[in-house]
């Protein structure tokens, strides 16, 4: 074979945000045949050539980017796309609220706001879908999602978390679940497909206007200014409805 | 080489404050949580404190929570235990250790003594 | 407190009040030292001498030193993080 060999997937089960002390599974998946996995969590020094590990109790210094390799012969493999293990459950729960209030008529604006007692710059704000409810969120910096011209597709249950950008992998535990309801349509709310899309961005101007809308079932971001965004890779894997464990700090 | 120095260990009164300090090198600090470990020869090696690395989360021992603070300066490679309302069972050798589970590096340690 | 004489294998035990599954390190100290880390998750290994091994999982685990070096007297100690963050007594090491 000439060239390195194709890069592994690495997946984390049941997903990747874990509640502190409950399970999960990190997982590398390359060709059949490989003669040696190699697992690291980077910015550290540490590694395991295995291609499974099992954390049996999430703890917070084991959140952060992980990544992994094979080895066939004496060839190594291009290394997999990042993936990012983040705790939740490190900070108490922030409070989601929806300005002027959750009910809105079809073709109004709404503006979801999560609110922390903590100075956090950072929050995340997700839908919950069918048939796999908690998907990955998508980041922004600022704590208010504004909604303009809401559709039928806006109904559902939002939750968002707070984070500090110092610690970005260490986040709250979930807000209590706000229900949007769309009135004055009779068209069925879309649901989130099993595997969206992952266009997360990370802004890097923090005062830029975020526009949340949701088309064609998949989140996307849409913004009034020049803003810098780097696309990162998906880093949930498709699998059956996850269940989230929350505890305070 | 990874080098952790502790100081501001001492002699102290009952209820009285100190303030411990670690200065790191040989390594990226901030990519790393740190901790304090203390052992006392009646108790043996006892964690204390950790603080993430970025340092927004912190958590301390039920024994010495609402008494002591640890914290971080990334921009110094310090790490910073304060430690107030002082008692005779926190008399023990104090240690600045990488990690947060494990303990990877430790520093020499240094020695604080609470009595009257 | 353990003797052994030099060359001698040598195996620590340390059990856990519950099980920890392979959050397990175990240390070492010399006289008027800091620990030392030697090994984590039960049985990584860090940088330390190979004679150093560790195995179990659970409740249960073990330190084995192949054979016992006069700079191996001291004291040794496993620390469980599963569960908060707990340190055993420890096990002084000397020679016979």
């Known amino acids: 074979q000439s060239g390195p060999l194709p890069k592994p997937s690495l997946q984390a089960l049941p997903s990747s945000l874990v509640p502190l002390e409950k399970p999960v599974t990190l997982r590398c998946q390359g060709p059949p045949g490989v003669d040696l996995y190699r697992l690291e969590k980077l910015s550290s020094s540490r590694y395991q050539d295995q291609a499974v590990l099992f954390i049996p109790a999430m703890k917070r210094s084991l959140a952060g980017r992980y990544r992994c390799s094979y080895q066939n012969g004496s060839l190594w493999s291009l290394p997999s796309d990042q993936l990012e293990l983040v705790a939740t459950g490190v900070f108490a729960k922030p409070s989601l609220s929806a300005q002027p209030g959750p009910a809105v008529s079809s073709g109004g604006d709404v503006t979801l706001q999560c609110q922390t007692r903590y100075g956090f710059d950072q929050f995340a704000l997700y839908k919950e879908g069918d048939p796999a409810p908690y998907k990955n969120p998508e980041r922004w910096y600022r704590a208010s999602f504004p909604i303009i011209t809401v559709t039928a597709a806006h109904s559902g249950t939002y939750r968002c978390y707070s984070f500090s950008s110092r610690d970005p992998y260490l986040w709250s535990a979930p807000s209590d679940p706000l229900e949007l309801v769309v009135t004055g349509t009779s068209v069925t709310p879309s649901r989130l497909p099993t595997e969206p899309p992952s266009p997360v961005a990370e802004f890097s101007e923090a005062t830029a206007e975020l526009t949340v809308s949701f088309t064609n079932e998949v989140f996307t971001t849409e913004t009034s200014r020049s803003i810098t965004a780097s696309p990162k890779e998906s880093d949930s894997p498709a699998g059956p409805a996850r269940q989230y464990y929350t505890k305070g700090n | 080489e990874v080098k952790l120095q502790e100081s501001g260990g001492g002699l102290v009164q009952p209820g009285r404050s100190l303030k411990l300090s670690c200065t790191a090198s040989?390594?990226?600090?901030?990519?790393?949580?740190m901790s304090w470990v203390r052992q006392a020869p009646t108790r043996g090696l006892e964690w204390v404190a950790s603080i993430s690395s970025g340092g927004a989360s912190a958590y301390w021992r039920d024994s010495v929570k609402g008494r002591f603070t640890i914290s971080r300066d990334n921009a110094k490679s310090a790490l910073y235990l304060q430690m107030d309302s002082l008692r005779s069972e926190d008399t023990a050798t104090y240690f600045c250790?990488?990690?947060?589970?494990?303990?990877?590096?430790w520093g020499q340690g240094v020695m604080v003594a609470v009595s009257s | 407190l353990l003797s052994a004489s030099v060359g001698d294998r040598v195996t620590l035990n340390c059990t856990a009040s519950q099980n920890v599954y392979k959050n397990l390190a175990w240390y070492q100290q010399k006289l008027g030292e800091a620990p030392r880390l030697l090994l984590y998750s039960a049985n990584s290994q860090t940088g330390i001498p190979s004679r150093f091994s560790g195995s179990g999982s659970g409740p249960d685990f073990t330190l084995t030193i192949s054979s016992l070096q006069p700079e191996d007297v001291a004291s040794y100690f496993c620390q469980q993080y599963y569960s908060g963050n707990t340190f055993g007594a420890g096990t002084k090491l000397e020679l016979k």
């Open positions: 250790a990488r990690g947060e589970l494990d303990f990877d590096y």
């Open positions: 040989g390594f990226t600090f901030s990519d790393y949580f």
